[in-house]
């Protein structure tokens, strides 16, 4: 049967507290994904920036995740209104704000 | 890394207005709650103002309430604070700051001037 969005959500949030808590070295290497500047469509538009970086094991269950939340297809490379043109940040940092806007949307029972 | 860059401070005399905006880089801004706090010269630090993740709700401090208004364009990842009718007491550094309640999360700029005198 499907999961219900709440308990999805919640299980994202857990995976990404797992990769913030359990982080010893650089995350993915310290790869760079864009920035996006747009509140709309958080779950693609955090895919769209995520699913360019490759080799991560720590964030493919992530990734993952994501594509469930996200309704259209999403590849590597694609262009989207909501990343911030030549604004790139570093992984780590990205999980981290991701986590906790998710923690918010979840208190505010956004939960797709 | 990430970094709140406060401008806009200055002189103004009392009555005068200015906008203090906050440009942010180095994290995802539109999904934070942020705000604005001050400190005046000798003074604490004062909550001023803030606005939600997606600007649809504000608080402000009773001190600056119908005077000031916060807002913010997600697109540029900037903060505003807008004063009008500034007074002598309005004088402090204001800070750009995150807002959220979780640990870890707290970022602040440096910092702009803002003197209010005749």
């Known amino acids: 049967s499907p999961v219900p969005p709440s308990t999805a959500l919640k299980e994202l949030i857990e995976e990404l507290v797992n990769i913030t808590q359990n982080q010893k070295a650089p995350l993915c290497n310290g790869s760079m994904v864009w920035s996006i500047n747009l509140t709309a469509g958080v779950y693609c538009a955090a895919l769209e920036s995520l699913i360019n970086v490759s080799g991560c094991s720590a964030i493919e269950k992530t990734q993952r995740m994501l594509n469930g939340f996200c309704p259209h297809k999403v590849s590597a490379g694609q262009f989207s209104s909501l990343r911030v043109r030549d604004t790139k940040i570093e992984v780590a940092q990205f999980v981290k704000d991701l986590l906790v806007h998710l923690k918010k949307l979840f208190r505010e029972g956004q939960f797709n | 890394g990430v970094q709140l860059l406060e401008s806009g401070g200055g002189l103004v005399q009392p009555g005068g207005s200015l906008r203090l905006s906050c440009a942010a880089s180095g994290f995802v801004f539109p999904w934070y709650d942020m705000g604005w706090v001050r400190q005046a010269p000798g003074k604490g630090l004062e909550w001023v103002s803030s606005?939600?993740?997606?600007?649809?709700?504000?608080y402000y401090a009773d001190s600056v309430k119908g005077r000031f208004t916060i807002s913010r364009d997600n697109s540029k990842n900037t903060l505003y604070l807008q004063m009008n009718s500034l007074r002598a007491e309005d004088t402090a550094v204001y800070y750009c700051?995150?807002?959220?309640?979780?640990?870890?999360?707290?970022?602040w700029g440096q910092g702009t001037l803002v003197t209010v005198s005749s």
């Open positions: 700051a995150t807002a959220e309640d979780e640990p870890g999360y707290d970022y």
């Open positions: 606005i939600d993740w997606k600007g649809g709700k504000t």
